[in-house]
Amino acid sequence: MSITGISPITEYLASLSTYNDQSITFALEDESYEIYVEDLKKDEKKDKVLLSYYESQHPSNESGDGVDGKMLMVTLSPTKDFWLHANNKEHSVELHKSEKPLPDQAFFVLHNMHSNSVSFESKTDPGVFIGVKDNHLALIKVDSSENLSTENILFKLSETHHHHHH
């Protein structure tokens, strides 16, 4: 899968929550960021994530679509210069400081079930999705026989009216 342009086709600032309405939050600890899945107290501010959407071409041998074989890839950045990365060896999701061009591990194929319900498939390990495991984000293998609407890999994007990216 190759990204067809170096610039995102659009960017979207949103808060990210699980299908069960737990918030995805990011905390700076010992000069590195930790990712948490937690219930927020009432009126507690949700963390924002900048989603950058890129167009990607299917590998030509995988698809008969020709120029139409496009997918949406996203990168997720909760704070400047940091992006979510797939660590396929450890089956973990980590936040790393990176410079552009971003490594493939920072790209995820966007699947959306409708409206603001989405799943993120690792670009570097097809069939593996960001999911929730033991109150943390992890990489979860989804068999093709399973329905992608399995709840632990579904996330909700809720729009934010703030346009800053801290």
Epitope: I9, T10, G64, D65, G69, L110, N112, S115
Partner: antibody, heavy 121, light 106 residues
């Protein structure tokens, strides 16, 4: 080349049923969301129903919920719209459309030529 | 539900004119907006997706812009073959079309 061919339209009495089919070619059908959109004579476009690429998720316009059913057969590259309890206000040209991106409900990139459904006694 | 309102309903302009069509959403749709063109007796055709991206094969005189609730389709130099009805369409929450703007040549 992407092609979408709708069939099954025609004249039907109120309260009766009709099943529309849309046969797709020129792309990997099982990767894409599919849609039905309608246009009453001389009017604008109205989204009717959507189905995701594996058929596990379906969505409907409120006024057709419980009467219309969208389904797909990925082996035959076909999407269907079963329309029951038809009303005069369902009279329209029905278009089939494909999603713009694999696995994504964002945008419609190609439309068929449409099939006319007339509900009248 | 999100409502989409297009203006004007009918636009009459001369060949070569710069033409601007407007589309307003009832809520923020985060640039999840397309424009399509429908000529008389034909199926709609996608022109612009995600607010400002030109669909393959569409002439570069078409462009889109906007954010939040306000969006615009611009035809930089109107051509006779651009006579059609133009629809905006949002997919941020559900799927909704505007009522259309009919573009005519003076």
């Amino acid at each position: 080349e992407v092609q979408l061919v709708e069939t099954g339209g025609g004249l039907v009495q109120p309260g009766r049923s009709l099943k529309l089919s849309c046969v797709a070619s020129g792309f990997t059908f099982s990767n894409y969301w599919m849609y039905w959109i309608r246009q009453a004579p001389g009017m604008g476009l109205e989204w009717v129903s959507s189905i995701n690429n594996d058929g596990g998720n379906t969505y409907y316009l409120d006024s057709v919920k419980g009467r219309f059913t969208i389904s797909r057969n990925n082996a035959e590259n076909t999407v269907y719209l079963q329309m029951n309890s038809l009303r005069s206000e369902d009279t329209a040209t029905y278009y089939c459309a494909k999603g713009h991106y694999s696995y994504s409900s964002y945008s419609f990139s190609y439309w068929g030529q449409g099939t006319l459904v007339t509900v009248s006694s | 539900d999100i409502q989409m309102t297009q203006s004007p309903s009918v636009l009459s302009a001369s060949v070569g004119d710069r033409v601007t069509l407007s589309c307003k959403a009832s809520h923020n749709i985060n640039k999840h907006l397309d424009w399509c063109q429908q000529k008389v007796g034909e199926a709609p055709k996608l022109l612009i997706y995600f607010t400002n991206n030109l669909q393959t094969g569409i002439p570069s005189r078409f462009s889109g812009s906007g954010s939040g609730t306000d969006y615009t389709l611009t035809i930089s130099s109107l051509q006779p073959e651009d006579v059609a009805t133009y629809f905006c369409f949002q997919y941020n929450s559900g799927w909704t079309f505007g009522q259309g703007t009919k573009v005519e040549i003076k």
